[in-house]
């Protein structure tokens, strides 16, 4: 019986060039978290495994940092980073819980309004 729920930051926005923390939290269950995947629909960004530690995909190595906790910090944001991110909690004995975060990366205010002299 899966009693847990995933709480996420929901829809978030950040400026191009900046950074953002993707964070999920599993509550209402005593199940043991054994692995957390961070994924987009078409690719894996990172895995935090209880035994193996962190694995960051080579595609994101330069701009993804593990943490805080089981979260993920995405740096040097580009507009191409806009989209949906999934936190996938592997637990024992419950099974898998999935949360989602929609990130919108905005052009910086300088880029939007032009340089002012």
């Amino acid at each position: 019986m899966m009693t847990g729920t995933i709480e996420t930051t929901g829809n978030i926005s950040a400026e191009k060039g900046g950074s953002i923390i993707l964070q999920c939290h599993l509550s209402s269950t005593t199940a043991q978290v054994t692995q957390v995947n961070w994924e987009q629909q078409d690719q894996l960004l990172a895995i935090c495994n209880a035994d193996l530690g962190w694995h960051i995909s080579p595609s994101f190595k330069d701009r993804v940092a593990p943490g805080p906790g089981l979260g993920l910090t995405l740096q040097s944001l580009t507009v191409n980073d806009t989209g949906e991110y999934f936190c996938i909690y592997h637990t024992y004995p419950d099974g898998t819980y999935t949360g989602r975060i929609f990130l919108e990366v905005l052009e910086s205010s300088v880029a939007e309004h032009g340089a002012r002299f």
Epitope: Q35, N37, E39, L44, I47, L52, S59, E84, F86, T96
Partner: antibody
Framework: DVQLQESGPGLVKPSQTLSLTCTVT?????????WNWIRQPPGKGLEWMGY???????RYNPSLKSRITISRDTSKNQFSLKLSSVTAEDTATYYC???????????WGQGTLVTVSS | DIQMTQSPSSLSASVGDRVSITCKAS??????VAWYQQKPGQAPRLLIY???YRYTGVPDRFSGSGSGTDFTLTISSLQAEDVAVYYC?????????FGQGTKLEIK
Amino acid sequence: DVQLQESGPGLVKPSQTLSLTCTVTGYSITSDYAWNWIRQPPGKGLEWMGYISYSGSARYNPSLKSRITISRDTSKNQFSLKLSSVTAEDTATYYCARKGYPAYFAYWGQGTLVTVSS
Amino acid sequence: DIQMTQSPSSLSASVGDRVSITCKASQDVSTAVAWYQQKPGQAPRLLIYSASYRYTGVPDRFSGSGSGTDFTLTISSLQAEDVAVYYCQHHYSTPYTFGQGTKLEIK
């Protein structure tokens, strides 16, 4: 329970376009997940062809990219495969499947055999 | 593309035997590997995902292990109904690719 069912012609002539539809029952294709096509030539292994996500964005196997289109009809809860300029090499059993989180395939149609022959 | 290479391509074992099938990825995929069982005339059935997590309803004689590039599917005590072709698949990034399959028969 989620069920997927492929339908379409079992015989297609070389150079023509193969068209298949997957009808999903028990789950709305606009609610979540990505909806995939996977094929298996007779006596051979499995090849992922592509998907359309619940939000409508598609992703294709680069080996097929110039020939493949996956679309959907949300009113009928169906998604479709079109593969153009087919040859005998495209003879296969075609499966539709739902991709989970992570990207495993837990739900499959029963498959439909398409033969490319004149 | 990430290639998945399975071995052996076929194997024969007796009921009650412990059987292992291996899969090697062409690059590090961490734990992003799934295993499927396919019986003649049927669609594949998911057994294991994320290298070692048994899918709902899969008997506990099936287990998966490995990380990085080397993965193993083990059947602890082979049953007659386990005769099938077994496939590994990486779920690291698109395009998802499968191993060529291992045909398992009963001696």
